[in-house]
Amino acid sequence: APGPVPRSVSLPLTLKELIEELSNITQDQTPLCNGSMVWSVDLAAGGFCVALESLINVSGCNAIYRTQRILHGLCNRKAPTTVSSLPDTKIEVAHFITKLLSYTKQLFRHGPF
């Protein structure tokens, strides 16, 4: 699990990098992370920390390694919380990435920095 509070990162710049990375991933036609499934989470309620807590359970997937890194930088929570998953709902990583991309774009357009 991720460790202590990371040093500060430039939020607008990091969000832009995350959008670029997620966009690249969604354009890749190969099955993402060999079809691994993750918990669907309420991004609006939990933000990048719950996204990280869900994606952190995906192992050995180079395609989302940079996404995991960026999310770790964006999530400055000291300790992981329980994933606020939608009851028993698992979705493919590819679907999760699409949802995360939409959320990040929305935040980038409207979020206060």
């Epitope: 460790g3 990371p6 500060s8 952190i56 192992s59 050995g60 390694y65 890194r69 770790h72």
Partner: antibody, heavy 118, light 111 residues
Framework: QVQLQESGPGLVAPSQSLSITCTVS????????VNWVRQPPGKGLEWLGM???????VYNSALKSRLNISKDSSKSQVFLKMSSLQSDDTARYYC????????????WGHGTSVTVSS | NIVLTQSPASLAVSLGQRATISCRAS??????????MHWYQQKPGQPPKLLIY???NLESGVPARFSGSGSRTDFTLTIDPVEADDAASYYC?????????FGGGTKLEIK
């Protein structure tokens, strides 16, 4: 509990090729990354390369032309092939796994000793 | 490639004292506010064992006598207090950039 075990030839003649197999138990290779690391007698560790669970392969740039890493996920085996061996390739060869982010090598095999000699 | 330089190459520390090992990277191993530097211990005849990940996080089961610190290019592994069982070689390793690289190692002797 993830376990890794290397098996190799022990002795290789100069200019010949080396083939080592790493058998992984306790985790599917579709979702597990395996590294190859070697250690010459009395010396330090040298990272050779790795294969990610999703198939991406990365090599040590200095050895790239001599290395080939592959896997058979159905048999839970990862393979290291190294060509044109010389005496300075004599080393203990380890496979090491990193399951989850941040992908530090948290599981190691015991290694297999390879001697290059005629 | 990122070159990791460890110092000293060897050191002897008295039982109960503090051991400090340094690892310097030829360029930053930080990414998005985290340091992708890890530390391993290797005892004679055994494979390496992960001690510390992401510069300062203790791997499960590793005694709290071990600690890691640092960022960007300068990192430190500290063992305090040193015990007889800590006689081993210690290696830093980065995975911020491919190819991954190891430091040259530091051999710790207990006096």
């Amino acid at each position: 509990q993830v376990q890794l075990q290397e098996s190799g030839p022990g002795l290789v003649a100069p200019s010949q090729s080396l083939s080592i197999t790493c058998t992984v138990s306790g985790f599917s290779l579709n979702a597990y990354s395996v590294n190859w690391v070697r250690q010459p007698p009395g010396k330090g560790l040298e990272w050779l390369g790795m294969i990610w669970g999703d198939g991406k392969i990365v090599y040590n740039s200095a050895l790239k032309s001599r290395l080939n890493i592959s896997k058979d996920s159905s048999k839970s085996q990862v393979f290291l092939k190294m060509s044109s061996l010389q005496s300075d390739d004599t080393a203990r060869y380890y496979c090491a796994g990193d399951g989850y982010y941040p992908y530090a090598m948290d599981n190691w095999g015991h290694g297999t000793s390879v001697t290059v000699s005629s | 490639n990122i070159v990791l330089t460890q110092s000293p190459a060897s050191l002897a520390v008295s039982l109960g004292q503090r051991a400090t090992i340094s690892c310097r990277a030829s360029k930053s191993v930080d990414s998005y506010g985290n340091s992708f530097m890890h530390w391993y211990q290797q005892k004679p005849g055994q494979p390496p064992k992960l001690l510390i990940y992401l510069a300062s996080n203790l791997e499960s089961g590793v005694p709290a006598r071990f600690s890691g610190s640092g960022s960007r290019t300068d990192f430190t592994l500290t063992i305090d207090p040193v015990e007889a069982d800590d006689a081993a070689s210690y290696y830093c390793q980065q995975n911020n950039e491919d190819p991954r690289t190891f430091g040259g190692g530091t051999k710790l002797e207990i006096k």
